[in-house]
Amino acid sequence: GSTVPPMVNVTCSEVSEGNITVTCRASSFYPRNITLTWRQDGVSLSHNTQQWGDVLPDGNGTYQTWVATRIRQGEEQRFTCYMEHSGNHGTHPVPSGNSHHHHHHHH
């Protein structure tokens, strides 16, 4: 099939002991190979500080996955989610304020 770029959205969990979990979700993409990783101040986070979901079919012939990491509350602006898919790439900031999220479709 032809390339379908991912929808990427970044969300924050509730605060716990001064920490929040930020999750970057990519959905509705094809083919299944995708790079999704967190950066702090532009530097890639190590694998041992991130958690990944499997790349799974979403029932529409496309795929979905996620990556999460735990950060200190108030440092959200230092973190970005980086995505590479089929020769395209994008960087997605953590939303300011837990009630908001960013949603972006790559072309």
Epitope: N33, T35, T37, S46, H47, Y82, E84, H89, G90, T91
Partner: antibody, heavy 120, light 107 residues
Framework: QVQLKESGPGLVAPSQSLSITCTVS????????VNWVRQPPGKGLEWLGM???????DYNSALKSRLSISKDNSKSQIFLKMNSLQTDDTARYYC??????????????WGAGTTVTVSS | DIQMTQTTSSLSASLGDRVTISCSAS??????LNWYQQKPDGTVKLLIY???SLPSGVPSRFSGSGSGTDYSLTISNLEPEDIATYYC?????????FGGGTKVEIK
């Protein structure tokens, strides 16, 4: 067919800088990371750093002050520059494509390497 | 940095032998481990990724296993073209680091 080929000066004088080019074919630099790895004679492999599809870089902190990695997407070339070379920088320098898929991160295709000797 | 140790720097085996190469990490690396083969001419090839996954084109006589800090590469039936040096590499924590290598020779 994915290929990477390094080209370098061969010989560099101590305290001078090193510039190596990695020319790739068979894939787009906008969608893949490329790593630099070196190997001193008779020793093991050492990761130097990498450049991502968007041009962002990560470096080995032990060498970060002397290293710079850049690229020209249109020419399919990646550039390694290292300053203040000493004799222990004598090594074979490799570029390698990085595949980074969730829990998996590996260097799936390597160039043949270019030998750099630091000597006066 | 995480230190990767391959205690056996070289080994000699007969054609058809089962050969096991060990690698240990200075701390747990969550299966974030790859193996590479370097031929005498310097050519480097990916053999195993994420502890036990085999890239396409790599013969099934190669296999990997392990967990925590201890990992191994097994060649089930040594062939002449397997004469090479084998390196483990962790990517749990930046920078990625390699073991010192194990050179496999024919008896």
């Amino acid at each position: 067919q994915v290929q990477l080929k390094e080209s370098g000066p061969g010989l560099v004088a101590p305290s001078q800088s090193l510039s190596i080019t990695c020319t790739v074919s068979g894939f787009a630099l906008t969608g893949s990371g490329v790593n630099w790895v070196r190997q001193p004679p008779g020793k093991g492999l050492e990761w130097l750093g990498m450049i991502w599809g968007d041009g962002n870089t990560d470096y080995n902190s032990a060498l970060k002050s002397r290293l710079s990695i850049s690229k020209d997407n249109s020419k399919s070339q990646i550039f390694l520059k290292m300053n203040s070379l000493q004799t222990d920088d004598t090594a074979r320098y490799y570029c390698a494509r990085g595949a980074h898929y969730g829990k998996r991160w590996y260097f799936d295709v390597w160039g043949a390497g270019t030998t750099v000797t630091v000597s006066s | 940095d995480i230190q990767m140790t391959q205690t056996t720097s070289s080994l000699s085996a007969s054609l058809g032998d089962r050969v096991t190469i060990s690698c240990s990490a200075s701390q747990g690396i969550n299966n974030y481990l790859n193996w590479y083969q370097q031929k005498p001419d310097g050519t480097v090839k990916l053999l195993i990724y994420y502890t036990s996954s085999l890239p396409s084109g790599v013969p099934s006589r190669f296999s990997g296993s392990g967990s925590g800090t201890d990992y191994s590469l097994t060649i089930s039936n040594l062939e002449p073209e397997d004469i090479a040096t084998y390196y483990c590499q962790q990517y749990s924590k930046l920078p990625p680091t390699f073991g010192g290598g194990t050179k496999v020779e024919i008896k």
